[in-house]
């Protein structure tokens, strides 16, 4: 139900919660218009309904939140702050809802918030506090356990003048606030490079999916941290080739599974570790799969099959005998 | 033609009731956020409250927080606003306006406007 | 909340002249994606009329002697030729954030 007291003694970040009061006490926990609520189930529904603000009269009782497919644009301070405090809500699904901007202390005042979806959003412009919730070094730590952003890049044309890879990650580390995170998923971002400290300093992962990306290359991403990881998705990126260093730390941790269908693998000499290893190790999904792109010769033949006698390299002429 | 018509101002004892209504034509009344907002005598314009398109979210100015109600009826193309405990320094000229969402939007129709004047 | 202070308060511009309208923000109202600065026209006895959105674009059916710039905290309208049908009290108004305020308004008379 809706707030009927003064929030004058609430965070100031979260100007939305100051007005969005009811000015005479809802029927208890009543449904929304455009939603469908089940209190037995905890779970409200605002779906498909072109909705531009988050609801106001959010049901207390509220676990699980879909709000998906909506025109909200903006997601303000505390966009989720209510009073009573939506305290049980855990699930926040926002997928899909043309969200370009989600501003720091965004998800303020949801004490009970692991799993939040933003998926299919252009998000232009994620704050670096936009899951922190305050710019101090240090945070208090974020309740969420797993955080969805497949999908998350908007048009070129829309971009900012930086780094789309730097704003998602600055928000994921700032305040070290998402140290409890176990799931992330990072799907289908035309990230071009994975920045060497994101991992490091997310030590709780369990599942991370960077699957249908544009990485080339894992050489300054270690791995080393994520004692706990149990699934690393890199299908459908550019990787080339693994080389030693990632191997090993790879190969290092415990619970790993690790998926690399639909790379354009290069099976010259530089793949022969690879396949070294692709031979022994157990944590490769669906290694059989394992094909090569190039070179022109190599084209389709797994990479399981292949021995050293397989992988050369051109030799490189010296200058004087090249030709221009 | 966008068209928004305020009714229902008039003189009222402070602590007493009033509630205005706007007829809205001439656009799809069911897609739009809709804003009260008021203008004292010589004085500039201050925002009162919102709704949006389907009644979902509501939002009011500190000044009229648990005084005032918004509310609207889609199938009517009426927005209404509800004001009790009238203040003197509730006495203004307000106006309806309609907008495309909160934040992104802004006041693009205006009402003419009616005079509420709260008066012992 | 954010306050929104016009300069000046009254301006006198001879017909055909520049007119410029200054509001500045009590802290930033835009962001990379959009600018969430608004101003307005009102004449004696009539409701106030949305002249720019977004701080530069202009509303449809406004002349394009009407202009907006800004960013972050500083914005400006301008009026590049008066004519005597601008004489109005101009507002700007942002819609950052609840609650949405107004700046105090400019009068803009003919000198």
């Known amino acids: 139900s809706s707030p009927t007291s003064s929030a004058s003694s609430f965070s100031s970040s979260a100007p939305f919660l100051a007005s969005a009061v009811s000015a005479q006490p809802p029927l208890p926990d009543q449904c929304p218009a455009l939603c469908e609520c089940s209190e037995a189930a905890r779970t409200v529904k605002c779906v498909n309904r072109n909705l531009t603000e988050v609801p106001t009269d959010l049901p207390a009782y509220v676990r699980n939140l879909f709000l998906t497919g909506n025109q909200l644009a903006v997601l303000p301070a505390g966009a989720f702050a209510r009073r009573p405090p939506l305290a049980e809500l855990a699930a926040l699904n926002l997928s899909g809802s043309r969200l370009d901007e989600v501003r720091a202390g965004a998800f303020e005042h949801l004490p009970s918030l692991r799993q939040l979806d933003l998926s299919h959003n252009p998000l232009a412009d994620l704050s670096p506090f936009a899951f922190s919730g305050s710019n101090a070094s240090v945070s208090a730590p974020s309740p969420l356990v797993e955080l969805i952003l497949n999908h998350i890049v908007p048009p070129e044309d829309e971009r900012q003048n930086r780094s789309f890879e730097g704003m998602v990650v600055a928000a994921l580390l700032a305040g070290r606030a998402l140290q409890g995170l176990r799931r992330l998923e990072l799907a289908s971002n035309h990230f071009l490079y994975l920045p060497r400290d994101v991992l490091a300093q997310l030590p709780s992962l369990r599942h991370l999916d960077l699957s249908n990306n544009s990485l080339v290359s894992l050489t300054y991403v270690s791995f080393r941290n994520l004692t706990h990881l149990e699934s690393l998705h890199l299908e459908d990126n550019a990787l080339k080739v693994l080389h030693n260093g990632t191997l090993a730390e790879l190969q290092g941790l415990p619970h790993i599974r690790v998926f690399l269908d639909n790379n354009p693998w290069v099976c010259d000499c530089h793949m022969a570790d690879m396949v070294t290893w692709l031979k022994e190790t157990e944590v490769v999904q669906g290694k059989d799969r394992l094909t090569c792109a190039y070179p022109e010769k190599m084209r389709n033949r797994v990479l399981l099959e292949l021995n050293s006698a397989d992988l050369d390299c051109d030799p490189i002429l010296p200058p004087s005998l090249q030709t221009s | 033609e966008v068209q928004l018509v305020e009714s229902g101002g008039g003189v009222v004892q402070p602590g007493r009731s009033l509630r205005l209504s706007c007829a809205a034509s001439g656009f799809t009344f069911s897609n739009f956020g809709m804003h009260w907002v008021r203008q004292a005598p010589g004085k500039g314009l201050e925002w009162v409250a919102y709704i949006s398109s389907g009644s979902t979210s509501f939002y009011y100015a500190d000044t009229v927080k648990g005084r005032f109600t918004i509310s609207r009826d889609n199938s009517k193309n009426t927005l209404y606003l509800q004001m009790n405990s009238l203040r003197a320094e509730d006495t203004a000229v307000y106006y309806c306006?309609?907008?495309?969402?909160?934040?992104?939007?802004?006041?693009?129709?205006w009402g003419q406007g009616t005079t509420v004047t709260v008066s012992s | 909340d954010i306050v929104l202070t016009q300069s000046p308060d009254s301006l006198a511009v001879s017909l055909g002249e520049r007119a410029t309208i200054n509001c500045r923000a009590s802290q930033s109202v835009s962001s990379s994606s959009y600018t969430y600065l608004h101003w307005y026209q009102q004449k004696p006895g009539q409701p106030p009329k949305l002249l720019i959105k977004?701080?530069?674009n202009l509303e449809s059916g406004v002349p394009d002697r009407f202009s907006g710039s800004g960013s972050g905290t500083d914005f400006t309208l301008t009026i590049s030729s008066l004519q005597a049908e601008d004489v109005a009290v101009y507002y700007c108004?942002?819609?950052?954030?609840?609650?949405?305020?107004f700046g105090q308004g400019t009068k803009l008379e003919i000198k």
């Open positions: 108004q942002h819609s950052w954030e609840i609650p949405l305020t």
């Open positions: 977004s701080a530069s």
């Open positions: 306006s309609r907008t495309n969402s909160l934040l992104r939007g802004f006041f693009d129709a």
